[in-house]
């Protein structure tokens, strides 16, 4: 029997390489049974996760899963960092794994570094 708890399926240690100036959609896959939970996004600042209040979000519904989407239109250099989605369900707070955005500022990066290079050398993002 499948659990009817809300589950947030952001992959553990997931990472995205994106360009400043481009649009980007960050998806939080949400599984629920009856009532869709209230889901929010936050950005990690040290050990605290700062709620993103005034950001454009939307829902995309698919057959077996829904996606709560955080829109970046466009991506800005300071969007670099780690994000988490969380859901309120039956008075419980369910938190996803964090997902990390590596933003390359095309104006300052003459040659786009590789994804693996950005993961291991984050200072490249701020050259």
């Amino acid at each position: 029997k499948e659990s009817c708890d809300v589950q947030l399926y952001i992959k553990r240690q997931s990472e995205h390489s994106i360009l400043a100036g481009d649009p980007f959609e960050l998806e939080c896959p949400v599984k629920y049974c009856a009532n869709r939970p209230h889901v929010t996004w936050c950005k990690l600042n040290g050990t605290t996760c700062v709620k993103l209040e005034d950001r454009q979000t939307s829902w995309k519904e698919e057959k077996n899963i829904s996606f709560f989407i955080l829109h970046f239109e466009p991506v800005l250099p300071n969007d670099n960092g780690s994000y988490r989605c969380s859901a309120n369900f039956q008075s419980n707070l369910i938190e996803s794994h964090s997902t990390t955005l590596y933003v390359t500022d095309v104006k300052s990066a003459s040659e786009r570094p590789s994804k693996d290079e950005m993961a291991s050398r984050p200072w490249l993002l701020y050259r």
Partner: antibody, heavy 120, light 112 residues
């Protein structure tokens, strides 16, 4: 059921490029991570790297990073490994493995492995 | 890199004896999510590794309950309470907490 199957040339010349494919069935690769692991004859296991097929993001073993490229093709549900400038030390059994998702994130399914010999 | 050191490198036991394999990591494997991604694999000759234990102590389905895992932080143990002939294999610990992922060097279990 979940299956992974490695394929590619069994013999590669020194200084050449090793190219392998991991064909996956019974699951959607974009929901998981795909890893490559190798095992030289009579030795232990060495992690090569992994890819997130959902977006192509890779992580590599620093000892191999300058020579390795892992890629994926969601439409074919497969991942690939390329290792350049090979030497005899790259002779090994190469495995691809799936990292299962929420909530365990471990290598729960492996291919049978393919033996690659580097020799002229 | 996280170094995973297993001990002993090999052990030879009689049927029914207890096997203990240790794995020590050079850094804590406790992840930010509060879980410890330490796994044990069994590899028999000519076969790929098979997952036995994940998250330190959770037994994979189909794995006999004579196998168990324990530990925390940097010190972990795989125990086989009563060794059987089919347990002859090489056992590897693996950490999935930090990049790069790393394996222990392996412990070979033989029957006396």
């Amino acid at each position: 059921q979940v299956q992974l199957q490695e394929s590619g040339p069994g013999l590669v010349k020194p200084s050449g490029t090793l190219s392998l494919t991991c064909a996956d069935s019974g699951f959607n690769i974009k929901d998981t991570y795909i890893h490559w692991v190798r095992q030289p004859p009579g030795k232990g296991l060495e992690w090569i790297g992994r890819i997130d097929p959902a977006n192509g993001f890779t992580r590599y073993n620093p000892s191999l990073k300058s020579r390795v490229t892992i890629s994926s093709d969601k439409s074919k549900n497969q991942a690939s490994l390329k290792l350049s400038s090979v030497t005899a030390a790259d002779t090994a059994v190469y495995y691809c493995a799936r990292e299962d998702g929420y909530p365990y994130y471990t290598l729960d399914a492996w291919g049978q492995g393919t033996t690659v010999t580097v020799s002229s | 890199d996280i170094v995973m050191t297993q001990s002993p490198d090999s052990l030879a036991l009689s049927l029914g004896e207890r096997a203990t394999i240790n794995c020590k990591s050079s850094q804590s494997l406790l992840d930010v999510d509060g879980k410890t991604y330490l796994n044990w694999f069994q590899q028999k000759p000519g076969q790929p590794p098979k997952r036995l234990i994940y998250l330190v102590s959770k037994l994979d389905s189909g794995v006999p309950d004579r196998f168990s895992g324990s530990g925390s932080g940097t010190d972990f143990t795989l125990t086989i309470s009563s060794v059987q002939a089919e347990d002859v294999a090489v056992y590897y610990c693996w950490q999935g907490t930090h990049f790069p992922r790393t394996f222990g060097q392996g412990t070979k279990l033989e029957i006396k």
